[in-house]
Amino acid sequence: QEEDLPRPSISAEPGTVIPLGSHVTFVCRGPVGVQTFRLERDSRSTYNDTEDVSQASPSESEARFRIDSVREGNAGLYRCIYYKPPKWSEQSDYLELLVKESSGGPDSPDTEPGSSAGPTQRPSDNSHNEHAPASQGLKAEHLY
């Protein structure tokens, strides 16, 4: 009997505090066999999918979501979810991205490493579909 899918983890490179205009890459990790990783922003209201999935280790796959030039509007909460046919995983914990003005000061590091994994509650919002592609006849918001 197959158990529930393991929760994904999320991390940010080079960290979770990013100077304005710098780049950041969110890294989503899950088990081998993932078809699609989804990076959700602010409680599912927007998301980005990728099927560019690579094997990070014999037991783990990953996908990377890069923002080339971070703007203030990129600040917020992010989390990962994945589709391993025929079902979706639970979400990762949230990771908060902070955007700061470039100070250039030598005393303050530009980034702080950050990652998030483990248990989390499903959101109670019903906004999963808000920016989703047309559902071709299916209503959404009712997950397993």
């Epitope: 009997q1 099927e51 079902k87 999963h128 579909n129 299916l138 959404a140 009712h142 397993y144």
Partner: antibody, heavy 121, light 107 residues
């Protein structure tokens, strides 16, 4: 609207192969999977396998791993199922069905009209 | 493999009746169950997805319920066009598996 148009009926000799097609329209072909389902006359439905055209990943029932091969052509939005080493047990109607998963759940929602395969010497 | 058991192979009903078709999974499949209607010579038509959600265009006399291992498709105010075969499907795990079907016929 979503449509899955399947190829016409096939009459084949035992031991040969057939290749069935399923042309998709009305949605983005690479955003969904495509399942194939077998139904023998007067019988129930049997899942054969599923392919994800975006990357070609496919999943099969253990029963048909040596019988069926699923492929997809993104340029023509067409999925294919090849059945080989045909026997009378393969005589059936074969349906393709869209496997929709974009909104955070799975649903086999739209079905093709079916292709009848008759294996006879 | 997960076995989906539809214990009633045939069910007799009359126009206007309410009928419930059941499906039992051999293990917990959460709400990953769909219901299909099939008429002779036609392809299956999706009625219910995720145990309780009506597909587009499906009349509201069709209702799905259940989660875990026990699922029910209820047709209230049966119409003559509802006479058909009904199949459940689990999509929690591969291989996807269907119930054997329940044929709804007139008394």
């Amino acid at each position: 609207q979503v449509q899955l148009q399947q190829s016409g009926a096939e009459l084949a000799r035992p031991g040969t192969s057939v290749k069935l097609s399923c042309k998709a329209s009305g949605y983005t072909f690479t955003s969904c999977g495509l399942s194939w389902v077998k139904q023998r006359t007067g019988q129930g439905l049997e899942w054969i396998g599923e392919i994800y055209p975006s990357n070609g990943n496919s999943y099969y029932s253990d029963k048909v791993k040596d019988k069926a091969t699923l492929t997809a052509d993104k340029s023509s939005s067409t999925a294919y199922m090849e059945l080989r080493s045909l026997t009378s047990e393969d005589s059936a109607v074969y349906f393709c069905a869209r496997a929709y998963y974009t909104n955070g759940y799975y649903a086999m929602d739209y079905w093709g009209q079916g292709t009848s395969v008759t294996v006879s010497s | 493999d997960i076995v989906m058991t539809q214990s009633q192979k045939f069910m007799s009903t009359s126009v206007g009746d309410r009928v419930s078709i059941t499906c039992k999974a051999s293990q917990n499949v959460r709400s990953a169950v769909a219901w299909y209607q099939q008429k002779p010579g036609q392809s299956p038509k999706t009625l219910i997805y995720l145990a309780s959600n009506r597909h587009t265009g499906v009349p509201d006399r069709f209702t799905g319920s259940g989660s875990g291992t026990d699922f029910t498709l209820t047709i209230s105010n049966v119409q003559s066009e509802d006479l058909a075969d009904y199949f459940c499907l689990q999509h929690w795990n591969y291989p996807l598996t269907f119930g054997a079907g329940t044929k709804l016929e007139l008394k």
